[in-house]
C-alpha cells in the first residue's frame, strides 16, 4: 500500500509536471496570431485513456515531436526557458510518476490532436490524479 | 523505404467522375500530412492543398476550393484526390507528396511518382 | 497570394562550371521574429517526380550534394550549384511556405551547352 511520503511525493511531482505543462500552454496562448495558426498544424496522438500513472507512457511517447514543435516555433514572441530542459524535466518527472516495472503499449485514440487540445488533455489528467490524492 | 505509391494513369471523357489514390509505405501515415500538386502538360507545379490523415484536417488553395476534394482512409494509410465532373483542363499529372508534421515548417520531402489523368472526349 | 518569379527561364550550364537560378517573391518570406525564410528549392529530373534539395532557405535535404547551396534574403534568394554534373539537368522550382496557400516559381529549366 502506497505510505503517506509517498503519495506526497507523487502529487508534488503531479503538481510540478501540471505547472510545466500549463507553462507551455500559457505561452502558446499568449502567442500572437501568425504562429499560433502555425503550430496548430503540427498534430499529436492523444490516448485512448488516461485515467491511470502508468497512461503516463502515452505522453513519454509524444514529448520528441512537443521539443519539435516548440523548437521550431520558437521565437522573440514565444520564448520558453531552454526547451531541452524543459522536456527532459518532464520526462523524467513521467519515468518516475508511470514506473518502469510495466512496459505499457500506449493505446491511441482515432484521430490526431493539435498541440493546445493535447496539452489541455494531459492537464486536465494531471488534475484529475492530484484531485484523488488529496 | 518510405514511398508514396500512385495510383494508374487514367482516361476519362468530360463530365465523368473520377478518385486517384497515394499509398504511404515506411513511416507513420498518420503523423505527416499529405499534400497533392498538379503539373499541366509542359507546365510549372501548382499547389492544390493538403490532409492530415490523423484528423481529416484539409486545406484547400483557393484556386482549388470546390474543384476536387481530398481525403484519406487511415486504416489503409491511403489519401485520394477527387473530381465528381472532369473537365478537360483537368488533364494533368497529380503528384501526391509528404509533408512533415507539420506544413508550414517542412518541405516536401517524398514525393509520389505521379498520376497521369486524361481527360477528352 | 504570394507570387513567385523565377529568372532565367532556361539556363544552359557547362559542366564543372558554376550556375545561379534567381527566385523573387511578392512580399518578405522572412519571419523575422523566428528568423526562419520559408523559401524551398526543388528539382524535377526530366521524366521523373520533383525532389526537394533546399528547405527553409538554405538547409540540404537528406542525400543532396554540397555543391547545392540557397542563400537570400526577404523577397531575393538564389540556388547555387557550384560546379555542375550532367545529373543536374532539369527543372528547378522555388516555392514558399510562409503563408497559405503554398506557391511555386514558373520553373527554370537547366540544360546542358
Known amino acids: 500500500a502506497p505510505t503517506s511520503s509517498s503519495t506526497k511525493k507523487t502529487q508534488l511531482q503531479l503538481e510540478h509536471l501540471l505547472l510545466d505543462l500549463q507553462m507551455i500552454l500559457n505561452g502558446i496562448n499568449n502567442y500572437k496570431n501568425p504562429k499560433l495558426t502555425r503550430m496548430l498544424t503540427f498534430k499529436f496522438y492523444m490516448p485512448k485513456k488516461a485515467t491511470e500513472l502508468r497512461h503516463l507512457q502515452c505522453l513519454e511517447e509524444e514529448l520528441k515531436p512537443l521539443e519539435e514543435v516548440l523548437n521550431l516555433a520558437q521565437s522573440k514572441s514565444f520564448h520558453l526557458r531552454d526547451t531541452k530542459d524543459l522536456i527532459s524535466n518532464i520526462n523524467v518527472i513521467v519515468l518516475e510518476l508511470k514506473g518502469s516495472e510495466t512496459t505499457l503499449m500506449c493505446e491511441y485514440a482515432d484521430e490526431t490532436a493539435t498541440i493546445v487540445e493535447f496539452l489541455n488533455r494531459w492537464i486536465t489528467f494531471c488534475q484529475s490524479i492530484i484531485s484523488t490524492l488529496t | 523505404e518510405v514511398q508514396l505509391v500512385q495510383s494508374g494513369a487514367e482516361v476519362k471523357k468530360p463530365g465523368e467522375s473520377l478518385k486517384i489514390s497515394c499509398k504511404g509505405s515506411?513511416?507513420?501515415?498518420?503523423?505527416?500530412?499529405i499534400g497533392w500538386v498538379r503539373q499541366m502538360p509542359g507546365k510549372g507545379l501548382e499547389w492544390m492543398g493538403i490532409?492530415?490523415?490523423?484528423?481529416?484536417?484539409?486545406r484547400y488553395s483557393p484556386s482549388f476550393q470546390g474543384q476536387v476534394t481530398i481525403s484519406a482512409d487511415k486504416s489503409i494509410s491511403t489519401a485520394y484526390l477527387q473530381w465528381s465532373s472532369l473537365k478537360a483542363s483537368d488533364t494533368a499529372i497529380y503528384y501526391c507528396?509528404?509533408?512533415?508534421?507539420?506544413?508550414?515548417?517542412?518541405?516536401?520531402?517524398?514525393w509520389g511518382q505521379g498520376t497521369t489523368v486524361t481527360v477528352s472526349s | 497570394d504570394i507570387v513567385m518569379t523565377q529568372t532565367p527561364l532556361s539556363l544552359p550550364v557547362t559542366p564543372g562550371e558554376p550556375a545561379s537560378i534567381s527566385c523573387r517573391s511578392s512580399?518578405?518570406?522572412?519571419?523575422?521574429?523566428?528568423?526562419?525564410?520559408?523559401l524551398d528549392w526543388y528539382l524535377q529530373k526530366p521524366g521523373q517526380s520533383p525532389q526537394l534539395l533546399i528547405y527553409?532557405?538554405?538547409y540540404r535535404a537528406s542525400g543532396v550534394p554540397d555543391r547545392f547551396s540557397g542563400t537570400g534574403s526577404d523577397t531575393d534568394f538564389t540556388l547555387k550549384i557550384s560546379r555542375v554534373e550532367a545529373e543536374d539537368v532539369g527543372v528547378y522550382y522555388c516555392?514558399?511556405?510562409?503563408?497559405?496557400?503554398?506557391?511555386f516559381g514558373g520553373g527554370t529549366k537547366v540544360e546542358i551547352k
Open positions: 507528396t509528404r509533408q512533415g508534421r507539420s506544413f508550414y515548417y517542412y518541405g516536401m520531402d517524398v
Open positions: 515506411g513511416y507513420r501515415f498518420t503523423s505527416y500530412w
Open positions: 490532409i492530415h490523415p490523423g484528423d481529416s484536417d484539409t
Open positions: 512580399q518578405s518570406l522572412l519571419d523575422s521574429d523566428e528568423g526562419n525564410t520559408y
Open positions: 527553409t532557405l538554405s
Open positions: 516555392m514558399q511556405r510562409i503563408e497559405f496557400p503554398l506557391t
